[in-house]
Interface confidence: low
């Protein structure tokens, strides 16, 4: 399937609008600090060049690879050295090293200001004045802050963003119409970005075998009526799509994702009865819908797994003949029977099964050795079940904010070396598992909770890799993808940690506290809580609760005072002194 001109091929397949959007996303994800206007200029130049290649595939440079064309374009940026420092050295390299170099410099935590949402009327005016620029700005701002965002999915978010403004800027109460939609897009976007980051980490850090195993388990849960060969085909195609997007090959990724959606819709009968409503939708919506589709009903007549995987005398023979295929079939069979298990649990079970076969197939009596293998699964299953039960009970007892605080204390004690902003961000997100999953029926709780926690803990791993400070975090993040969450759960108070010296400045607050939003106030308080635990890691729950209650009372008192700043200046030192005494 070779083409004389790759850029012409992708332009024709994707169409001008998607081509331009994807190139803008690609450039913004690579050069995260460049101004919007610079990127738009580069994208326009690439698009004009692509059009000349569509007209004549033999024209000069049209035979160059996309990496060569895009890399050459990025390396024309005048301020590369001043803005990006050593990233400019990438431009001295040849492909494919140059693209690898750009990928290496993607920054998961770029030093960019938080996006401020203007007044609704201002946004609607900007939307009406120049809709195209307005939407490009959205793609640019999201892509540069989320350098691994799943590019074809970002086009879908942009389409929804456009639809929200088109509808709400006509409404009588623009704000009431628009703001909830923008909040929903923001929250969904953050979740989508984090989920994709885990996929890329899985591919980049653990190889495509790890990603394929994840995909077999998840697709088998979704499509329990599909044959193993069908699931395997979907897994192969999906792996290609995500490998491309994680590598920055966004045009190929979007094109292959569209092909996968087409294939699924043409083969619904052999995949799932749930695809029908997705397949009637336009491309971007269709692909999103297929990715999010609910699990199909399980076939009624599935036999016991034990016959083929425990009782059969051919287990070792079948395993030896094609290990990965045999294990893949085991994972498929187990997953399609267990939509109530998390993907990570299913992968742990497959790993345990593999370890047992490795040991037993070399034993004198293999069958006797592996006869009880399913019994060994019980503790692996019970551990996440108990964890979800305990944490949902705690969430229901405390509510989200206090549940987050409990997790903040728990995780700060486990890994106190991690930076305070990272501990606050990660613990707040871990705490959101309660509202997201605990309200679900029992059969959906574990897959919701544990697979969500895997996504959040991957964020911790990604941030920690940039600035490693804790051997325990490195160990949990790198030793086993499927055991990351149990590894973090098993961490205890770090006895080797030398407590942080008390710094009164950390606990000095001003009247600006009073004008913060509720969320911002929570973050301030939670930041103080982390610092307290870093100062006194052995403080009891009661001691910490007492200090936090005093803190809340002190802030509330001063925010009600006539002279707020004077109150903070006077009451602040008293609060600090009382806190030190309480924790002594």
């Amino acid at each position: 399937d070779t083409h004389k001109s790759e850029v012409a091929h992708r332009f024709k397949d994707l169409g001008e609008e998607h081509f331009k959007g994807l190139v803008l996303v690609a450039f913004s994800q690579y050069l995260q600090q460049c101004p919007f206007e610079e990127h738009v200029k580069l994208v326009n130049e690439v698009t004009e060049f692509a059009k000349t290649c569509v007209a004549d595939e033999s024209a000069e440079n049209c035979d160059k690879s996309l990496h060569t064309l895009f890399g050459d374009k990025l390396c024309t940026v005048a301020t590369l050295r001043e803005t990006y420092g050593e990233m400019a050295d990438c431009c001295a390299k040849q492909e494919p090293e140059r693209n690898e170099c750009f990928l290496q410099h993607k920054d998961d935590n770029p030093n960019l200001p938080p996006l401020v949402r203007p007044e609704v009327d201002v946004m609607c005016t900007a939307f009406h004045d120049n809709e195209a620029t307005f939407l490009k700005k959205y793609l640019y701002e999201v892509a540069r802050r989320h350098p691994y965002f799943y590019a074809p999915e970002l086009l879908f978010f942009a389409a929804r963003y456009k639809a929200a403004f088109a509808e709400c800027c006509q409404a009588a109460d623009k704000a009431a119409c628009l703001l909830p939609k923008l909040d929903e897009l923001r929250d969904e976007g953050k979740a989508s970005s984090a989920k994709q980051r885990l996929k890329c980490a899985s591919l980049q850090k653990f190889g495509d075998r790890a990603f394929k195993a994840w995909a077999v388990a998840r697709l088998s849960q979704k499509f329990p009526k599909a044959e193993f060969a069908e699931v395997s085909k979907l897994v192969t195609d999906l792996t290609k799509v995500h490998t491309e997007c994680c590598h920055g090959d966004l045009l190929e990724c979007a094109d292959d994702r569209a092909d996968l959606a087409k294939y699924m819709c043409e083969n619904q009968d052999s995949i799932s009865s749930k695809l029908k409503e997705c397949c009637d939708k336009p491309l971007l919506e269709k692909s999103h819908c297929l990715a999010e589709v609910e699990n199909d009903e399980m076939p009624a007549d599935l036999p016991s797994l034990a016959a083929d995987y425990v009782e059969s005398k051919d287990v070792c023979k079948n395993y030896a003949e094609a290990k990965d295929v045999f294990l893949g079939m085991f994972l498929y069979e187990y997953a399609r029977r267990h939509p109530d298990y998390s993907v990570m649990l299913l992968l742990r079970l497959a790993k345990a099964y593999e370890a047992t076969l490795e040991k037993c197939c070399a034993a004198a009596d293999p069958h006797e050795c592996y006869a009880k293998v399913f019994d060994e699964f019980q503790p692996l299953v019970e551990e996440p079940q108990n964890l979800v039960k305990q944490n949902c009970e705690l969430f229901e007892q405390l509510g989200e904010y206090k549940f987050q605080n409990a997790l903040l204390v728990r995780y700060t004690k486990k890994v106190p070396q991690v930076s305070t902003p990272t501990l606050v961000e990660v613990s707040r997100n871990l705490g959101k598992v309660g509202a997201k999953c605990c309200k679900l029926p029992e059969a959906k709780r574990m897959p919701c909770a544990e697979d969500y926690l895997s996504v959040v803990l991957n964020r911790l791993c990604v941030l920690h890799e940039k600035t490693p400070v804790s051997e325990k975090v490195t160990k949990c993040c790198t030793e086993s993808l499927v055991n990351r969450r149990p590894c973090f759960s098993a961490l205890e108070l770090d006895e080797a940690y030398v407590p942080k010296a008390f710094n009164a400045e950390t606990f000095t607050f001003h009247a600006d506290m009073c004008t913060l939003s509720e969320k911002e106030k929570q973050v301030k308080k939670q930041t103080a809580l982390v610092e307290l635990v870093k100062h006194k890691p052995k403080a009891t729950k009661e001691q910490l609760k007492g200090v936090m209650d005093n803190f809340a009372a002190f802030v509330e008192k001063c925010c009600k005072a006539d002279d707020k700043e004077a109150c903070f200046a006077e009451e602040g030192p008293k609060f600090v002194a009382a806190s030190q005494a309480a924790l002594a």
């Epitope: 494919p96 693209n99 690898e100 170099c101 990928l103 290496q104 591919l203 980049q204 850090k205 653990f206 190889g207 495509d208 075998r209 790890a210 590598h247 990965d324 890799e465 490693p468 490195t474 790198t478 030793e479 086993s480 993808l481």
Partner: nanobody, 116 residues
Framework: QVQLVESGGGVVQPGGSLRLSCAAS????????MSWVRQAPGKGLEWVSS????????YYADSVKGRFTISRDNSKNTLYLQMNSLRAEDTAVYYC?????????SGQGTQVTVSS
């Protein structure tokens, strides 16, 4: 096109040393953790060692700990395995692979034979 080409294998006496190399191309080498795995005659794949993308973190199977050293040179897109104090049980085809423990090889491998 992803390519991994292993080299440096050979026949060596017990207690001897070898240095294996793996030349990588066609993918973002410096963005990926890498591993060495081996397959002894008639056995399954066995993980040997892994290194993170920056080269700062290394991991070893118990059977090779203290004898083998994994390293990488991102400027040359090359992964290395220094093998000292070799034993008969180290005889195998050695493969490099993209990813951490559990990564699957795609190259031809290089044969290491430890024999007196």
């Amino acid at each position: 096109q992803v390519q991994l080409v292993e080299s440096g294998g050979g026949v060596v006496q017990p207690g001897g040393s070898l240095r294996l190399s793996c030349a990588a191309s066609g993918f973002a080498f410096r963005g990926f953790g890498m591993s060495w795995v081996r397959q002894a005659p008639g056995k399954g794949l066995e993980w040997v060692s892994s290194i993170n993308n920056g080269g700062s973190d290394t991991y070893y199977a118990d059977s090779v700990k203290g004898r083998f050293t994994i390293s990488r040179d991102n400027s040359k897109n090359t992964l290395y395995l220094q093998m000292n104090s070799l034993r008969a049980e180290d005889t195998a085809v050695y493969y490099c692979a993209i990813g951490g423990p559990g990564a699957s090889p795609s190259g031809q491998g290089t044969q290491v034979t430890v024999s007196s």
